[in-house]
Interface confidence: low
């Protein structure tokens, strides 16, 4: 199709080489067409025109994204050619940064239902640059945490070195929806709830004598509880002794509950005590069996192919540890009678 009639938008992504970060492009179809496709309508119901020139479907994923190769080749369907770019409804997610993401991206409706629709498309010229050392050293992270129940703030990484007074007007989106009230480089959250978690996008306009473009940054915000002040609990095994049958295989499970820590390095392992000897056992990998906001339950099993007389004289010890401390629980095997 002819892309000369597409509206054009220029975006700049300055990424940090120090951290992982993502980027998004919204299919910013001209108002009010966008509302038909992406439900990202910025107009209030009173402002919606009576006659829409572009009668699209309401299917949220009903847009097609293309990349325009720089050598003038035909447009390429994003989904077929770029595994690190994912389309989610009307948003294009770039999972990894890099200058190779620079280029022109075009979005348009999949279904062309009227002559007007042919020109209903947006061309986004994306320039991707690594952050220079001269840039602000302490810029806000692209991953930010908010402590549940407290006051918090979300900073726009590309503007976090500027004072509020110097900062240009910022447009914020949360999970693709415009946050029309927020205009500064920092969103202040009076009381943090779990629904404040999500993908935030901050845009501001930068101009020089020749042109203007939108500088965009993406912030992944997660809501967290405070770091635990306690060491892990062993939930299982509960009892100190376990009745077993000689010659039979046996699996003993160790389940431990670890409190939330931002830097989480849980340890869960089995070792065996036999008179004065003590050694760690090579056992299957630990697995997380339940994860909540406050804590995580991790399980690790010790497997004996066959219970022997010698095993009855040993103690099987589960050892769990976090940054606060460790807990152990030992199990003595006892032969089943009768």
């Amino acid at each position: 199709f002819n892309i000369s009639g597409c509206s054009t938008k220029k975006l700049l992504w300055t990424y940090s080489t120090r951290s992982e970060e993502e980027f998004v492009l919204f299919c910013d179809l001209p108002e009010p067409q966008k509302s038909h496709f992406c439900h990202r309508n910025r107009l209030s119901p009173k402002q919606v025109p009576e006659h829409l020139p572009f009668m699209g479907s309401n299917d949220l994923s009903d847009v097609q994204w293309y990349q325009q190769p720089s050598n003038g080749d035909p447009l390429e369907d994003i989904r077929k050619s770029y595994p690190h770019i994912i389309q989610d409804k009307c948003t294009l997610h770039f999972l990894t940064p890099g200058v190779n993401n620079s280029g022109s991206y075009i979005c348009r409706p999949k279904m062309i239902k009227s002559p007007y629709d042919v020109a209903c498309c947006v061309k986004m010229i994306l320039e991707v640059k690594p952050q220079t050392n001269a840039s602000c050293e302490y810029s806000a992270s692209h991953k930010q945490d908010l402590l549940l129940g407290s006051t918090g703030s979300i900073s726009c990484p590309s503007l976090s070195c500027q004072s509020d007074a110097q900062s240009p007007a910022v447009t914020w989106y949360k999970n693709g929806k415009l946050l029309s009230v927020e205009r500064s480089n920092r969103i202040v959250v009076d009381e943090v709830y779990d629904y404040h978690q999500g993908t935030y996008v901050c845009d501001y306009t930068q101009s020089d004598t020749v042109s203007s473009w939108t500088v965009r940054a993406v912030v992944q915000v997660r809501t967290i509880v405070g770091d635990t002040k306690l060491k892990p609990d062993i939930l299982d095994p509960v009892e100190d002794t376990l009745e077993v049958e000689l010659g039979k295989p046996l699996t003993i499970s160790c389940k431990a509950r670890f409190g939330f820590e931002r830097v989480f390095n849980p340890v869960i392992k089995w070792y065996i005590k036999d008179s004065d000897l003590e050694w760690e056992v090579s056992v299957p990998e630990a697995k997380s069996i339940k994860s909540t906001l406050k804590d995580e339950i991790i399980e690790r099993n010790i497997i004996l192919e066959k219970v022997t007389q010698r095993d009855l004289r040993r103690k099987f010890v589960c050892f769990v540890q976090n940054s606060i401390g460790n807990t152990t629980q030992s199990v003595q095997l006892k032969e089943k009678r009768g």
């Epitope: 306690l230 609990d233 009892e239 406050k294 807990t327």
Partner: antibody, heavy 121, light 111 residues
Framework: QEQLVESGGGLVKPGASLTLTCTAS?????????MCWVRQAPGKGLEWIAC????????TYYASWAKGRFTISKTSSTTVTLQMTSLTAADPATYFC?????????????WGPGTLVTVSS | DVVMTQTPASVSEPVGGTVTIKCQAS??????LAWYQQKPGQPPKLLIY???TLASGVPSRFSGSGYGTEFTLTISDLECADAATYYC?????????????FGGGTEVVVK
């Protein structure tokens, strides 16, 4: 035989303080379990107050209503105390000392007979 | 924190009958639930732990079932000695909290 015995209960005036003691016999506080205090007002249900981890980490847990006014401490390998301050008409109850395991295996759940606290002017 | 809701508050059944007491947790507590029997002037006595495991010395007339949020204590072949108040308790200890909470209790009257 493993046993818990509470002591220190009695009659106190409103606003007074009191310390209850739980003494263990037949075992000592050094494992992967908790020592807790639970109370029961006359004719009412059971109400958990606080727990302390039985090893030397001193990890404590309180019911939200008990924070600030009640303090649980491990004073030796066989004694745990509950300090209560600013006692009110809402505090009279039988106070039980309980040994508990995180996952609640039977041999770890052990209750003392209780000690009665009365608050009256 | 977890809230345990016990029903009914009171139940009356003849000797030889069956009593069913329900306990509902406000969130998933897996099988971390205990049942107690308490008689006047005595501390609670453990009947069942891990939702369905009978504590030692407890007659098999007592049985527990359930998982997650819904739990049941059943007493069959009621005897006069079963007249008491029964409590459920969440025995799941979190790491920053101990939701060591009890249900409100069910008084069992044996006629």
């Amino acid at each position: 035989q493993e046993q818990l015995v509470e002591s220190g209960g009695g009659l106190v005036k409103p606003g007074a303080s009191l310390t209850l003691t739980c003494t263990a016999s037949g075992f000592s506080f050094n494992g992967n379990y908790y020592m807790c205090w639970v109370r029961q007002a006359p004719g009412k249900g059971l109400e958990w107050i606080a727990c302390i981890y039985a090893d030397n980490s001193g990890s404590t847990y309180y019911a939200s209503w008990a924070k600030g006014r009640f303090t649980i401490s491990k004073t030796s390998s066989t004694t745990v105390t509950l300090q209560m301050t600013s006692l009110t008409a809402a505090d009279p109850a039988t106070y039980f000392c309980v040994r508990h395991k995180p996952a609640g295996g039977s041999s770890y759940i052990l209750w003392g007979p209780g000690t009665l606290v009365t608050v009256s002017s | 924190d977890v809230v345990m809701t016990q029903t009914p508050a009171s139940v009356s059944e003849p000797v030889g009958g069956t009593v069913t007491i329900k306990c509902q947790a406000s969130e998933d507590i897996e099988s971390y639930l205990a049942w107690y029997q308490q008689k006047p002037g005595q501390p609670p006595k453990l009947l069942i732990y891990s939702a369905s495991t009978l504590a030692s010395g407890v007659p098999s007339r007592f049985s527990g079932s359930g998982y997650g949020t819904e739990f049941t204590l059943t007493i069959s072949d009621l005897e006069c000695a079963d007249a008491a108040t029964y409590y459920c308790q969440c025995t799941l200890y979190g790491v920053n909290f101990v939701p060591n909470v009890f249900g409100g209790g069910t008084e069992v009257v044996v006629k």
